[in-house]
Amino acid sequence: QEDEDGDYEELVLALRSEEDGLAEAPEHGTTATFHRCAKDPWRLPGTYVVVLKEETHLSQSERTARRLQAQAARRGYLTKILHVFHGLLPGFLVKMSGDLLELALKLPHVDYIEEDSSVFAQSIPWNLERITPPRYRADEYQPPDGGSLVEVYLLDTSIQSDHREIEGRVMVTDFENVPEEDGTRFHRQASKCDSHGTHLAGVVSGRDAGVAKGASMRSLRVLNCQGKGTVSGTLIGLEFIRKSQLVQPVGPLVVLLPLAGGYSRVLNAACQRLARAGVVLVTAAGNFRDDACLYSPASAPEVITVGATNAQDQPVTLGTLGTNFGRCVDLFAPGEDIIGASSDCSTCFVSQSGTSQAAAHVAGIAAMMLSAEPELTLAELRQRLIHFSAKDVINEAWFPEDQRVLTPNLVAALPPSTHGAGWQLFCRTVWSAHSGPTRMATAVARCAPDEELLSCSSFSRSGKRRGERMEAQGGKLVCRAHNAFGGEGVYAIARCCLLPQANCSVHTAPPAEASMGTRVHCHQQGHVLTGCSSHWEVEDLGTHKPPVLRPRGQPNQCVGHREASIHASCCHAPGLECKVKEHGIPAPQEQVTVACEEGWTLTGCSALPGTSHVLGAYAVDNTCVVRSRDVSTTGSTSEGAVTAVAICCRSRHLAQASQELQ
């Protein structure tokens, strides 16, 4: 999903002055940064989250907060420390004048400061319900009583926890952090205050219309009666969950965040920390008919981000807007006219729509999967959700053209059996953010911490790119794509897989002088080829068109253009076997595909030859897709011939382990 630097407003204040004689001035050359929501109406100036550097202790946080207050007081400003964070992120929440930002950014330990902003419930119209008859018949859907080993935390509005549909299933915690309702004449009507949360609790675990009928839930109130909350309130809620987890460790935890605000670095960071503590976070993609990467927590890579589809598996339209989309969405789920508990009465049901409802479905599915396999990691759970989804059923024409390739065509589904998927080699495709158009621009795609990067490819709509390569970054491989002069930008595409006990490395061959092209193979004993990448420095590979042929009987070899450096991803893992599958079309084609057979998983996807009329290659589920320029611009020369190269792998070790369990 989103890289560290997203599309949000960043105000970097390079402050070097030593005024106030700070005893612990920031290290030379480091500059704390200020961030605020890019959506102006959602900004909450006057309240700021001051995030301190990672290893800062609670006592240092408190000292820094006191120092800020003292220095502000010397300037005649009143400040109020509203909360000191610890457990998830070090820092504090302060109410102060924006005039003090310069001062605050110079404090010791400060990493960045973010202005508070609003978050919103993602159901429409959640407080203008179309009441259905109080009796709802669930004859069609009777899932097993599932999710009983899992606790689902819901961060939402208040909820009517004794509604017949959810009675005894939801524990209302004493956590509440909500802003005042807008408008002087706002009338707090209990049933409206509870509407959003009650419905979602019913979708997750309701007796009649719930997905995981056995799941128990805990609710935290972070949204007010108008369905509005704050980033800071959500942060404090996430911290509350982490502290609860530390005080009383239970089984697997799922956190449902059916809300969205503008891109927030701090909210994404908190989600990352909680996810790395073993918590599964599920969030709404947002109802703005926009790129989900512009919203939080939807843009946090560690969060499972869910878009909404209807009964016909089409993206949900909500008034003039609709479900969000793009590379930050992991999958879609039902989110239109979803029946669930209504807070209008203790036995009423209602239909609501939105990405909140879609996220609640996935939280329920996650609870059932985790109840069946409590040891699943977040990466394993995400891969299973993707694997068991219905593929290629969404009509992509609804999405903006430039988002279609980035948006996963996946609709969540319960696995046919919650056990027995362990033998599969699971892989998913991760797209980077767009690089931007500058000559040296690059884009980076990363896998989750416990996934292996098995291959790397790139894509550019203009075709002007300089390929891609796998490189080490912070002890882990990443996929980096390179833009070319005159290009409009590139995407890096990582193929991220679950491969236990894997030992992977990248072998590189520099550009060859010989006319046969560049080749590289996996020479280490027991290592197999999982992916090929090529990267070149020249602006246009199309000026040299040598025939590039893969020598017969060389499955462990990558070949490419003689002016490109070629990178082979070579992995050793118990029982791992891979094979190369190619599909070449002699005539020019805008798209060439090759798929792996049943039982095999696509790990690598690349194009031969790597000439400039090839826009790039990427994996869609188990199919390798190679895109070329519009055939009308290439003509029917030999340059139009393109081969899609798929590397298909399976793990005999995983299959054997699964058989032993059964």
């Epitope: 009796r135 009777q142 009517q160 009675e167 005894g168 299933r169 939801v170 524990m171 007796r207 009465c345």
Partner: antibody, heavy 115, light 107 residues
Framework: QVQLVQSGAEVKKPGASVKVSCKAS????????ISWVRQAPGQGLEWMGW????????NYAQKLQGRGTMTTDPSTSTAYMELRSLRSDDTAVYYC????????WGQGTTVTVSS | DIQMTQSPSSLSASVGDRVTITCRAS??????LNWYQQKPGKAPKLLIY???TRPTGVPSRFSGSGSGTDFTLTISSLQPEDFATYYC?????????FGQGTKVEIK
């Protein structure tokens, strides 16, 4: 552990009112409402209604015809059932039970209506 | 209101017998059905909820089945402490309604 403790037996004259209490403990109060059920001597069980500890909302059986009121006091974890204009056929054991699902019951309160 | 019809209204059985009590709803109640056991002078005790789920502490000889309109309570091997009156109850719709009860007596 979950407990529902009801008030003691009552003897009332026809036309009078009775108020039975039910003190709940051992669970998250707001996660369940309280159902009231009565059982006339030698007869079966009859559901009278339900009341919420969360927001005080209630749900009555039609048969009570406005004679009954169910309330809760979250501060004392107590639910109340008041029955007015008592008649001899209101003689029964009155039970409180947890939630619509009635998974835990009070010990019962005997109400005798006699002139 | 949803009518709940229990049968038989009473039965005589011996210790060790397999006993089956049925309950029929006048309309579909999905699985929103509970079974209770009541002994003289005591409050009812929940035996089965959601048509087939046994709460903690209820002996495994008690089992429930059915969905929609027809439900069954089975006691696989009757024990001396099982002689009591059994009620089914629906909570699919308000008002919640009970069956008229089945009295299980010693033969």
């Amino acid at each position: 552990q979950v407990q529902l403790v009801q008030s003691g037996a009552e003897v009332k004259k026809p036309g009078a009112s009775v108020k039975v209490s039910c003190k709940a403990s051992g669970y998250s109060l707001t996660s369940y409402g309280i159902s009231w059920v009565r059982q006339a001597p030698g007869q079966g069980l009859e559901w009278m209604g339900w009341v919420s500890f969360y927001n005080g909302n209630s749900n009555y059986a039609q048969k009570l015809q406005g004679r009954g009121t169910m309330t809760t006091d979250p501060s004392t974890s107590t639910a109340y059932m008041e029955l007015r204009s008592l008649r001899s056929d209101d003689t029964a054991v009155y039970y409180c039970a947890r939630g619509f699902g009635m998974d835990r019951w009070g010990q019962g309160t005997t109400v005798t209506v006699s002139s | 209101d949803i009518q709940m019809t229990q049968s038989p209204s009473s039965l005589s059985a011996s210790v060790g017998d397999r006993v089956t009590i049925t309950c029929r709803a006048s309309q579909n109640i999905n699985n929103w059905l509970n079974w209770y056991q009541q002994k003289p002078g005591k409050a009812p005790k929940l035996l089965i909820y959601g048509a087939s789920t046994r709460p903690t502490g209820v002996p495994s000889r008690f089992s429930g089945s059915g969905s929609g309109t027809d439900f069954t309570l089975t006691i696989s091997s009757l024990q001396p402490e099982d002689f009591a009156t059994y009620y089914c109850q629906q909570w699919d719709d308000t008002p919640n309604t009970f069956g008229q009860g089945t009295k299980v007596e010693i033969k």
